[in-house]
C-alpha cells in the first residue's frame, strides 16, 4: 500500500489515509444517487473477508459505462497487488448471488469502516 | 482543549448575505470533516451542510442548496459557511460541529452565533 | 430523504423516575444513530454514538438501544441535571435528519 497515491494528495498516502479516501467516495455515491446506480447493473456479492479488494474491484470492474464508480474502481485497484481485468473471479466471489451496485457499494462501504474503526488499514 | 467557535452572525436584511466562521482548536482539523447546523428560534435542530477533511466532498439540505456556500482552511484550522440571499427563515443559531474521525456522527459542537435576517 | 420521528415530543417526570424516548426511522439506518442532550441556551452534547454506545464522561444511566428503524433513549434514574430536551440524529444518508426533540421537565 505504500504506492497509493493521487486521490487527495500528491505522493505516497499511508494506509490508513487511502482507506479514508476510498470510504469518502464510497459515502459519496451512496449519497448521490438520484437514479438507480450504474442503472441497476448487477454484479457478483463477495465475502468481506481477506483479500476483499481484490475481488470488489474483480466485480465491479465488469460494470462498464459507469462513470459513478470509476474513481471507486481506480482506488480499488491501488489496494490489490495484481492486476484484474474484466471477466476475472477469484473464491471470494459468492458466484451464485448477484446483487445490485448500489447494494454492493452499501455492503462494501459498512464492511470498511468496520475495518477503519478497527485498525485494520491493509 | 477541543474547542470549535463560531462567529459572524448578525442582524441582516432578506436578500443579504454574511459569512460565518467557525476556528478549531485542540486537534488536528485537517484529519476531520466539518458541518454546521442550525436552530431556529424555538425550534429543533437541522443540519445545513457538511465538508470532507480534504475538501473533496461536499454536501447541502435542500433548503439552501444554491444560496449557502460550505468552505474551509485547513492552514488556518477554519470552517466557513457563506450565506447568500438569505431569508427571514434563516433566522437561527448556527452551529459548527465537528464529524467523528470513526463516523459516528457529530462529537463536538460550538457554542453557536445568531444569525438574524429581518428587515 | 430519512425521516425521524421521535416521541414522546414531550413528559413530565420526577427525578429518580425511568424515563424512555423513541425514534423511528422511515428506512434501515443500521446503527447510524447517536443521542444528543440539549439545555436552554447551549449546544447539543452527544450521550450515545452508534445507537447503544455511551460516549466518555456520560453517566451510565444513559443508555441507546435498537437498530435499524426503531430506536431507544433510556435515562434509568433520572437526574435534576437530565432535564433537558433530547435529539436523535441519523447520519446513515445524507441530508442527515434529527429527530423533533423530546422536552423531559419536572412533573
Known amino acids: 500500500l505504500t504506492c497509493l497515491g493521487g486521490f487527495a494528495s500528491p505522493g505516497p498516502v499511508p494506509p490508513s489515509t487511502a482507506l479514508r479516501e476510498l470510504i469518502e467516495e464510497l459515502v459519496n455515491i451512496t449519497q448521490n444517487q438520484k437514479a438507480p446506480l450504474c442503472n441497476g447493473s448487477m454484479v457478483w456479492s463477495i465475502n468481506l473477508t481477506a483479500g476483499m479488494y481484490c475481488a470488489a474491484l474483480e466485480s465491479l470492474i465488469n460494470v462498464s459505462g459507469c462513470s459513478a464508480i470509476e474513481k471507486t474502481q481506480r482506488m480499488l485497484s491501488g489496494f490489490c497487488p495484481h492486476k484484474v481485468s474484466a471477466g476475472q473471479f477469484s473464491s471470494l466471489h459468492v458466484r451464485d448471488t448477484k446483487i445490485e451496485v448500489a447494494q454492493f457499494v452499501k455492503d462494501l462501504l459498512l464492511h470498511l469502516k468496520k475495518l477503519f474503526r478497527e485498525g485494520q488499514f491493509n | 482543549e477541543v474547542q470549535l467557535v463560531e462567529s459572524g452572525g448578525g442582524l441582516v436584511k432578506p436578500g443579504g448575505s454574511l459569512r460565518l466562521s467557525c476556528a478549531a482548536s485542540?486537534?488536528?482539523?485537517?484529519?476531520?470533516?466539518m458541518h454546521w447546523v442550525r436552530q431556529a428560534p424555538g425550534k429543533g435542530l437541522e443540519w445545513v451542510s457538511s465538508i470532507s477533511y480534504s475538501s473533496t466532498y461536499i454536501y447541502y439540505a435542500d433548503s439552501v442548496r444554491g444560496r449557502f456556500t460550505i468552505s474551509r482552511d485547513n492552514a488556518k484550522n477554519s470552517l466557513y459557511l457563506q450565506m447568500n440571499s438569505l431569508r427571514a427563515e434563516d433566522t437561527a443559531v448556527f452551529y459548527c460541529?465537528?464529524?467523528?474521525?470513526?463516523?459516528?456522527?457529530?462529537?463536538?459542537w460550538g457554542q453557536g452565533t445568531t444569525v438574524t435576517v429581518s428587515s | 430523504d430519512i425521516q425521524m420521528t421521535q416521541s414522546p415530543s414531550s413528559l413530565s417526570a420526577s427525578v429518580g423516575d425511568r424515563v424512555t424516548i423513541t425514534c423511528r426511522a422511515s428506512?434501515?439506518?443500521?446503527?447510524?444513530l447517536g443521542w444528543y442532550q440539549q439545555k436552554p441556551g447551549k449546544a447539543p452534547k452527544r450521550l450515545i454514538y452508534d445507537a447503544s454506545s455511551l460516549q466518555s464522561g456520560v453517566p451510565s444511566r444513559f443508555s441507546g438501544s435498537g437498530s435499524g428503524t426503531e430506536f431507544t433513549l433510556t435515562i434509568s434514574s433520572l437526574q435534576p441535571e437530565d432535564f433537558a430536551i433530547y435529539y436523535c440524529l441519523q447520519h446513515n444518508s445524507y441530508p442527515w435528519t434529527f429527530g423533533q426533540g423530546t422536552k423531559v421537565e419536572i412533573k
Open positions: 460541529a465537528r464529524e467523528d474521525y470513526y463516523y459516528y456522527g457529530l462529537d463536538v
Open positions: 428506512q434501515d439506518i443500521r446503527n447510524d
Open positions: 485542540g486537534f488536528t482539523f485537517s484529519d476531520y470533516n
